[in-house]
Interface confidence: medium
Amino acid sequence: QPPPPPDATCHQVRSFFQRLQPGLKWVPETPVPGSDLQVCLPKGPTCCSRKMEEKYQLTARLNMEQLLQSASMELKFLIIQNAAVFQEAFEIVVRHAKNYTNAMFKNNYPSLTPQAFEFVGEFFTDVSLYILGSDINVDDMVNELFDSLFPVIYTQMMNPGLPESVLDINECLRGARRDLKVFGSFPKLIMTQVSKSLQVTRIFLQALNLGIEVINTTDHLKFSKDCGRMLTRMWYCSYCQGLMMVKPCGGYCNVVMQGCMAGVVEIDKYWREYILSLEELVNGMYRIYDMENVLLGLFSTIHDSIQYVQKNGGKLTTTIGKLCAHSQQRQYR
Amino acid sequence: SAYYPEDLFIDKKILKVAHVEHEETLSSRRRELIQKLKSFINFYSALPGYICSHSPVAENDTLCWNGQELVERYSQKAARNGMKNQFNLHELKMKGPEPVVSQIIDKLKHINQLLRTMSVPKGKVLDKSLDEEGLESGDCGDDEDECIGSSGDGMVKVKNQLRFLAELAYDLDVDDAPGNKQHGNQKDNEITTSHSVGNMP
């Protein structure tokens, strides 16, 4: 059946358009030829003007942006919430790992505190910064911890007779720590465990934050002129003919949306890969690839490393006595 | 072996409930996130359909709008979408995504590459380098207990990892020990999710 004739007075169109744009100066009183229209190309007289078309295009674009935002709302909240939760949880894990380690020193080696607390605090501060993306080398962090600890262990536990501010010998002891492998293979073990677990944690957080950025980008997309015209034609051009209640055909809507979303849909392949790669990463986050597991057990490995030093204490003291004799003499003079 | 710092827990009850069967750990929370994310795996390819289904579209009406005229919903004209001669649809197809989308694709490619290189090969529980350090993969038994550390009797078992609940944030009294730098916000007693993270506008 043929479509009903347009409203002879454009009254319905006027009342609808009033909601979009207060003031009626753009709406014709009665249907006009509409030869200046560029989007809602008329087959006969029309109740639309060029200015109305422009307003429809703007409204269509805003509608589209709102639809896009509502489409991504649940996903966006999911990632934002989890990124926040994990970031905070990782910080808490680091804090507890630090507390465990400090507790181990307090209970087993009270003579090493408070210096040990300071070095442990600095180490875990670096751990936190690394997780958040700082350009810190994990091996350097671990080396610094053991370099700082050894002079204290040597002067407080192995050779307590030395004066307190032996700055020169401290430097010599730091060097000796690496050269003589004072802590055995424990620093290397900790480096491997900590670097693997922290790398994975860091990339996990980075990936979540990028997920937020991806959704935000989609959320705030601008649409092309062609898209604006297509949307206007689909949602509003029927009004120009006085057809206020009709809805777009389903297949037509799909074609228009595919045209408008051609660029956005390009993300699909990489988004799928992102989720599957993230899943693979998460599946591998256990044992030495799980920072929670590694950091909360560090106190034990550090304790074992100190025990190792103690076990070899006699031999070490002799060797270091010779190696750092020059520094010691200068201090005693 | 190390003196496990049990006596430093403020709330002794935490230790007693630390082995509840289905407690929520960080690792279970991660897996839960992945399961939820996987339900959005088709998010981008499904967007056009989603938007059509959430905007006014003729479903039960006999007539619908095809961009030019009112047509019967199942007619040829409805199927042709009224796109003919309206504008060059090819022009939309010629172009790649908007520049910001291109940038996001580049970033996704980069993170995907990083994620792939970081992923632990299946079945590779411990690295060869660690085995060489004398840490045998057989040293730890079930999934509930994970071992960390090495060298014979120095092995300590850390029970089951932190609970991912409010109990996660217990505080130890050494936090205020001299020389122990306090950085950031250390008064957390629970995990909050209200603040946003990342590049929010």
């Epitope: 560029q38 601008k222 092309s224 | 060059n88 197809k93 010629m94 790649g96 908007e98 291109s102 694709i105």
Partner: antibody, heavy 124, light 108 residues
Framework: QVQLQESGGGVVQPGRSLRLSCAAS????????MHWVRQAPGKGLEWVAV????????YYADSVKGRFTISRDNSKNTLYLQMNSLRAEDTAVYYC??????????????????????WGQGTT | DVVMTQSPLSLPVTPGEPASISCRSS???????????LDWYVQKPGQSPQRLIY???IRASGVPDRFSGSGSGTDFTLKISRVEADDVGVYYC?????????FGQGTK
């Protein structure tokens, strides 16, 4: 910086085939349509073909339609022109060119433009 | 196809003097949004073409402001306010409104 480098030109007998390549660098190749333009010795420029960003749409000048095929491999950042049934009048320097960049207009719409903003050095 | 006609085909100019090249299309290059889909390119001796002007009047990045494009619909002009020795080359107009893209014959 943005660069295009053509290769694959040479001398062949009429009726034979030749495949030109254009290696792109310095921009997101997979986001832009790409063109081939040629220039016969001592003559002006003649547009040959264009391919959309994803390779799904191709357009050709009437003079090469049915004989030349434009294609691209986005994973290799490379554009190709397969030239079959070559004629004497196809002798020319062949340039590949990248489409013009996007622009935003005052209403906040983004739009695209088909001009050619970067050209290669050409292959004969 | 849209036919592009340039004039003059040769234009001798003394450095420091202005120069003007005309380009006419067989149909309007003005699209519905008010943009003229016309480019100007220059090909200097032994070099590849490079874009000077796009959308009728927008100078491409790095192009000196001595160059300007004007016109609308079917009639377009490229002007050089003060010619320099380095401006020697062949200047082409090209329409980008519809396939096939077409060039003018060039002005030397």
């Amino acid at each position: 910086q943005v660069q295009l480098q053509e290769s694959g030109g040479g001398v062949v007998q009429p009726g034979r085939s030749l495949r030109l390549s254009c290696a792109a660098s310095g921009f997101t190749f997979s986001s832009y349509a790409m063109h081939w333009v040629r220039q016969a010795p001592g003559k002006g420029l003649e547009w040959v073909a264009v391919i959309s960003y994803d390779g799904s749409n191709k357009y050709y000048a009437d003079s090469v339609k049915g004989r030349f095929t434009i294609s691209r491999d986005n994973s290799k950042n490379t554009l190709y022109l397969q030239m079959n049934s070559l004629r004497a009048e196809d002798t020319a320097v062949y340039y590949c060119a990248k489409e013009g960049t996007y622009y935003y207009d005052s209403s906040g719409y983004w739009d695209y433009y088909y001009g050619m903003d970067v050209w290669g050095q050409g292959t004969t | 196809d849209v036919v592009m006609t340039q004039s003059p085909l040769s234009l001798p100019v003394t450095p420091g003097e202005p120069a003007s090249i005309s380009c006419r299309s067989s149909q309007s290059l003005l699209d519905s949004d008010g943009y003229n889909f016309l480019d100007w390119y220059v090909q200097k001796p032994g070099q590849s073409p490079q874009r000077l002007i796009y959308l009728g009047s927008i100078r491409a990045s790095g192009v000196p402001d001595r160059f300007s494009g004007s016109g609308s619909g079917t009639d377009f002009t490229l002007k050089i306010s003060r010619v320099e020795a380095d401006d020697v080359g062949v200047y082409y107009c090209m329409q980008a409104l519809q396939t096939p893209w077409t060039f003018g014959q060039g002005t030397k």
